[in-house]
């Protein structure tokens, strides 16, 4: 379809780099959530940091190209990196408007499919880009 994809846009304070240039921020009449219309893909992404007690959103926005996973209708995150001991970054890609607003589910920390404690370690800023 020719219509462009629109995604939720968010970048947590302290996250290095930005995906803002991958789209055009929209005026939605409300402060949050912000919306971004993708320029180079029809695909949204989301990154959440899962610790023992909670999941915290790190980034949401547009991908720079359509890749495997972008055909998903919903955000089904998968584990990607360990920014620090006891926390895991989960990412999703999906291809419907605002599909990255929230995830359908997150596996509990340490469950099958989650990288073990010996998984890749990264400095806080770098871990986001590893996840992307």
């Amino acid at each position: 379809p020719p219509n462009r994809r629109t995604c939720v846009f968010f970048e947590a304070p302290g996250v290095r780099g930005s995906t803002k240039t991958l789209g055009e921020l929209l005026d939605t009449g409300t402060e949050l959530p912000r919306a971004i219309r993708c320029l180079y893909s029809r695909c949204c992404f989301g990154i959440w940091n899962l610790t023992q007690d909670r999941a915290q959103v790190e980034m949401q926005g547009c991908r720079d190209s359509d890749e495997p996973g972008c055909e998903s209708l919903h955000c089904d995150p998968s584990p990607r990196a360990h920014p620090s001991p006891g926390s895991t970054l989960f990412t999703c890609s999906c291809g419907t408007d605002f599909c990255n607003a929230n995830y359908s589910h997150l596996p509990p920390p340490g469950s099958p499919g989650t990288p073990g404690s010996q998984g890749p370690q990264a400095a806080p800023g770098e871990s986001i880009w590893m996840a992307l």
Partner: antibody
Framework: QVQLQESGPGLVKPSETLSLTCTVS?????????WNWIRQFPGKGLEWMGY???????SYNPSLKSRITISRDTSKNQFFLQLSSVTAEDTAVYYC??????????WGQGTLVTVSS | DIVLTQSPSSLSASVGDRVTITCRAS??????????MHWYQQKPGQPPKLLIY???NLESGIPARFSGSGSGTDFTLTISSVQPEDFATYYC?????????FGGGTKVEIK
């Protein structure tokens, strides 16, 4: 300041391939932006042909999709247009343009390409 | 493809006149209340020059006598008091849907 300059043959024979180069100065084509080709027919109508993005992905006008290729040489900060099987209807002024958003803020001066035997 | 129809195709004006050009789209060019319609000015032998983006935002360096308005399918470019350097051809462009398309142009001539 972003500057763009088109270059290439001004005359192409029918059925051959039109090849143009856009040289970008003042900005790296891998930093940001979509790098577009737009043409203007003798009747003054404008047509967006396609782009190559800073990351190398491409998007083409479906009306040209079977004939158009846009590529780049990042070491020379250039991007290219190839349009195959040209006819007289492809005679136009060809512009390269840079766009941070979905409108075109930066344009080259344009180069006239005539398709004729 | 979205077809953009500009009217009039040409007009004559005197310096100081208020000039209004319209652009009608074959379908809405809005996304969640944001209008993806843009306006350009072109003089002979030059490339188009961006004037207005997203319906009503004035590009940096463009005089305030230029303004844009509209939403959905109907858009207007207004020159509040036309100056000698404004005699040119004006184009609208939509970017709400691929492929991007342009209007046929409106030539503003000196009366």
């Amino acid at each position: 300041q972003v500057q763009l300059q088109e270059s290439g043959p001004g005359l192409v024979k029918p059925s051959e391939t039109l090849s143009l180069t856009c040289t970008v100065s003042g900005y790296s084509i891998t930093s940001d932006f979509a790098w577009n080709w737009i043409r203007q027919f003798p009747g003054k109508g404008l047509e967006w042909m396609g782009y190559i993005s800073f990351s190398g992905s491409t998007s083409y006008n479906p009306s040209l999709k079977s004939r158009i290729t846009i590529s780049r040489d990042t070491s020379k900060n250039q991007f290219f247009l190839q349009l195959s099987s040209v006819t007289a209807e492809d005679t136009a002024v060809y512009y390269c343009a840079g766009s941070r958003y979905s409108w075109f803020a930066y344009w080259g001066q344009g180069t006239l390409v005539t398709v004729s035997s | 493809d979205i077809v953009l129809t500009q009217s009039p195709s040409s007009l004559s004006a005197s310096v100081g006149d208020r000039v209004t050009i319209t652009c009608r789209a074959s379908e809405s060019v809005d996304t969640y209340g944001n209008s993806f319609m843009h306006w350009y000015q072109q003089k002979p032998g030059q490339p188009p020059k961006l004037l207005i983006y997203r319906a009503s935002n004035l590009e940096s360096g463009i005089p305030a006598r230029f303004s844009g308005s509209g939403s959905g399918t109907d858009f207007t470019l207004t020159i509040s008091s036309v100056q000698p350097e404004d005699f040119a051809t004006y184009y609208c462009q939509q970017s709400n849907e691929d492929p991007y398309t342009f209007g046929g142009g409106t030539k503003v001539e000196i009366k």
